[in-house]
Amino acid sequence: AGGPGSRARAAGARGCRLRSQLVPVRALGLGHRSDELVRFRFCSGSCRRARSPHDLSLASLLGAGALRPPPGSRPVSQPCCRPTRYEAVSFMDVNSTWRTVDRLSATACGCLG
Amino acid sequence: AGGPGSRARAAGARGCRLRSQLVPVRALGLGHRSDELVRFRFCSGSCRRARSPHDLSLASLLGAGALRPPPGSRPVSQPCCRPTRYEAVSFMDVNSTWRTVDRLSATACGCLG
């Protein structure tokens, strides 16, 4: 289980980049009834390499317990891996009607902020 | 504990904005030895109001357990509360030398990404 495959997977999962998964249309929260699955692309991964001096000090302060974050809102000590471009997603609803929702899926990612 | 004061505090903590705290220089991770405290400003708070259709669907998928995030890297379903401007921080080290570190403290925040 901890062989070269899992190491490669962990390395591949690490950096900020575009991911893709098959998801149920009904779980997209669009209010459309559908039994179909559709390919949804999103961004995830670390942006540690893009940290500023501010981020490094913020991380240090948080790590040392020297900063007391506001309740329920921990500050982010690296840029966020976020979509920089989007595309529409199309799917068929239970009435066999094709629906298209603009800007629902990511097509490019970046370390923003 | 659940009176109007705590509700106001929670509301104030919620949105993305500039925060300020007094912190020990030694906890900034700069490599300078100092016994001083300095004012460190950072950004935190929610950016839920700035969510895109993509973010809403991503949050829905995550909430429904319909998305399987890469190991150790959960995607972010709202823009990040991050600094948009910075300022230098100055302090005195143990040798009574003034040190200035550029762009260490935030001066403005925004919902980025």
Epitope: A1, G3, G5, S6, R9, G12, A13, R19, S20, Q21, L22, V23, P24, E36, L37, V38, R39, S44, E87, A88, S90, F91, M92, W98, T100, S105 | G65, A66, R68, P69, P70
Partner: antibody
């Protein structure tokens, strides 16, 4: 190297059941979404079932929905297809296939296929 | 369901020829289009993934392009081992449909 080996095919009467198995080796089984694809004699390819890496999502086309059930045992590196209420039109070679990419980068391209197991539904 | 059509359904060509096969989807499938090669009695083999990605071990004479609903597979210089049936497949929307296939045989 990656290997997918199907078993469980054979001749069965209409209305009866059959369970296909696919033993996998050469890759981290639980990292990949898997599919069954069939091919009727002399015909094209037809996709029949999908299961996500952790078994949380499965999907079937209308032609088999309610009759076929896909499952997996990640501890045994084995994929299954339970086929009930079999019909003559289910006669085909059934291939077990794996996706090319890790579950979180899945694009639906099928990079390894088993040689297939023949299912014949006939009275 | 998304219908996949391929043209031509069959073609005859000579070694060294450039061959192009077209695949069309009835609805947009973004770039989730894959191409497979199948020889008689064998399992299909992945050639091209997500429109233009060349699968590891596949010769560079194979290439793919397209977007939305219209896609092509090109073989720049046909080799004896390329005589086979080629299938496109959309993996964007369930059910994941295949095209009917294009049989490439020797002229």
């Amino acid at each position: 190297q990656v290997q997918l080996v199907e078993s469980g095919g054979g001749v069965v009467q209409p209305g009866r059941s059959l369970r296909l198995s696919c033993e996998a080796s050469g890759f981290t089984f639980s990292d990949y979404d898997l599919h069954w694809v069939r091919q009727a004699p002399g015909k094209g390819l037809e996709w029949v079932a999908f299961i996500s890496n952790d078994g949380s999502n499965e999907y079937y086309p209308k032609s088999v929905k309610g009759r076929f059930s896909i499952s997996r045992d990640n501890s045994k590196n084995t994929l299954y297809l339970q086929m009930n209420s079999l019909r003559a039109e289910d006669t085909a070679v059934y291939h077990c296939t794996k996706e090319r990419d890790y579950y979180y980068d899945s694009s639906g391209s099928l990079d390894y296929w088993g040689q297939g197991t023949l299912v014949t539904v006939s009275s | 369901d998304i219908q996949m059509t391929q043209s031509p359904s069959s073609l005859s060509a000579s070694v060294g020829d450039r061959v192009t096969i077209t695949c069309r989807a009835s609805q947009t499938i973004n770039n989730y289009l894959n191409w497979y090669q199948q020889k008689p009695g064998k399992a299909p083999k992945l050639l091209i993934y997500t429109t233009s990605g060349l699968q590891s071990g596949v010769p560079s004479r194979f290439s793919g392009r397209g977007s939305g609903t219209d896609f092509t597979l090109a073989i720049s210089s046909l080799q004896p081992e390329d005589f086979a049936t080629y299938y496109c497949q959309q993996s964007y929307h369930s059910p994941f449909t295949f095209g009917p296939g294009t049989k490439v045989d020797i002229k």
